[in-house]
């Protein structure tokens, strides 16, 4: 019969701006891989079917709902020749290949904030105006897709640093919007970092820090 | 079906305590913010705040802050409007809803409201 | 806190006729990330619940027919209904979903003549 295929384990999604995949171990010897995934209250789709990869993308599918919480296994399938050369899923006696269980994943509550952009600042005597990209997301609404603002509105807020090239304290603000207003000392260059921020999260609330933008740097000026 | 479905009427004294609740069918509770709004008696709507399932994260309209309280249990995945300290002003018709899939898109369900009386 | 003003305070129509409301926030509702207009329209009948007509100002809610039309953009706001029928004859909202707190404006109550 063979020895029985192992079983996946360290399965992890991995996402950001809901571009997901879900990852696993080991790399697989004498057998492949399948996944499935379904809602709560769906059927198991499959995925990735007899795949050698430790990993499969699934953000075709959570994109369709992202506030769905989504489950996931990996299957372990022998080789398994049929008469049509193609492994099969199930034994000769149809029993289901061993298989592991993903953690649950809700896209909305969970996908990580990808580091955001400065996409302008402009000076106005002793006002800055610092606006971030709107970035976009492979979520869909009739065939466009949305921007992270579009999918979680109010839910979303940005918080920046910003300091005095010449020294290191920073002074923070923030925004519902993707603008933020701040007095800055007149005759002052300033640097920037924002961040994406969801502060009713309880996991992954805040993404990476944006590259730093300074005032006064040649491709900078004022809009870039 | 998305459904939301509210406690009874109640007639209460002023000075006591009202819990109503709202239970929601028919999607995923913890990733939805519920909002409560208030409509007087021949009067407009005003919203009171909202409660997000999954962290218990809540807004209040400064008006109801400190006698509503927002809560919600994801085991029966409902929500909860507790409002204390009762007084005439507070006759109404409470309603629940559900915020709309996409980002600041409105409130897309609602209860069928709970009448909340309050009478010496 | 952003205040919303509908105008008018009550209206009266004939069936077919086109009706057209206004609804002015005390501050831009446009996103500038995303360029929406965060603003809200809804229907409420008596002893019913409100039911939602349009999002981001002039998107249709699924099943909303397609007499009712939302337009505006910053400040300035319109629903219209361009054919009236007998079943639209209710106290119609705007709201501001822009920013905490939300705000509703006072209604317009929409009559048959």
């Known amino acids: 019969a063979g020895t029985p295929p192992g079983k996946a384990f360290n399965l992890t999604w991995i996402s950001a701006d809901f571009k997901t995949i879900l990852a696993w171990q080991p790399k697989p010897t004498n057998y492949t891989y399948t996944v499935q995934i379904s809602t709560k209250s769906g059927d198991w789709k499959y995925k990735c079917t007899g795949t050698t990869d430790t990993e499969c993308a699934l953000t075709d599918e959570i994109v369709k709902d992202v506030k769905q919480t989504y489950l996931a296994r990996v299957l372990s399938v022998p080789w398994r020749n049929s008469t049509h050369g193609k492994e099969t899923l199930f034994g000769t006696h149809g029993e289901e290949p061993p298989f592991t269980n993903a953690p649950e994943f809700t896209p909305y509550l969970e996908t990580n904030l990808g580091a955001p952009t400065i996409q302008s600042f402009e000076q106005v005597g002793t006002k800055v105006n610092v606006t971030v990209e709107d970035e976009r997301t492979l979520v869909r609404r009739n065939n466009t897709f949305l921007s992270l603002r579009d999918v979680f509105g109010k839910d979303l807020i940005y918080t920046l640093a910003y300091w005095k090239s010449s020294s290191s304290g920073a002074k923070t603000a923030a925004t519902n919007t993707n603008e933020f207003l701040i007095d800055v000392d007149k005759g002052e260059n300033y640097c920037f970092s924002v961040q994406a921020v969801i502060p009713s999260r309880t996991v992954n609330r805040a993404s990476t820090d944006s590259p730093v933008e300074c005032m006064g740097q040649e491709h900078h000026h004022h809009h870039h | 079906e998305v459904q939301l479905v509210q406690s009874g009427s109640e007639l209460k004294k002023p000075g006591a305590s009202v819990k109503v609740s709202c239970k929601a069918s028919?999607?995923?509770?913890?990733?939805?913010?519920i909002e409560w709004v208030k409509q007087r008696p021949g009067q407009g709507l005003e919203w009171m705040g909202d409660?997000?399932?999954?962290?218990?994260?809540?807004n209040y309209n400064e008006n109801f802050k400190g006698r509503a309280t927002f809560s919600a249990d994801t085991s029966v995945s409902t929500a909860y409007l507790q409002i204390s300290s009762l007084k005439a002003e507070d006759t109404a018709v409470y309603y629940c809803?559900?915020?709309?899939?996409?980002?600041?898109?409105?409130?897309?369900?609602w209860g069928q409201g709970t009448l909340v009386t309050v009478s010496s | 806190d952003i205040q919303m003003t509908q105008s008018p305070s009550s209206l009266s129509a004939s069936v077919g006729d086109r009706v057209t409301i206004t609804c002015q926030s005390s501050?831009?509702?446009?996103?500038?990330?995303?360029?929406?207009?965060?603003l809200t329209w809804y229907q409420q009948k008596p002893g019913k619940a409100p039911k939602l007509l349009i999002y981001?100002?002039?998107t249709r809610e699924s099943g909303v027919p397609s007499r009712f039309s939302g337009s505006g953009s910053g400040t300035d706001f319109t629903l219209t209904i361009s054919s009236l029928q007998p079943e639209d004859f209710a106290t119609y909202y705007c709201?501001?979903?822009?920013?905490?707190?939300?705000?509703f404006g006072q209604g317009t109550k929409l009559e048959i003549k």
């Open positions: 809803a559900r915020s709309g899939y996409y980002g600041n898109s409105g409130f897309a369900y």
């Open positions: 028919g999607y995923t509770f913890i990733t939805y913010w």
């Open positions: 409660i997000l399932p999954y962290s218990g994260s809540t």
């Open positions: 501050q831009s509702l446009l996103s500038s990330g995303n360029q929406k207009n965060y």
């Open positions: 981001w100002a002039s």
């Open positions: 709201q501001n979903d822009y920013t905490y707190p939300l705000t």
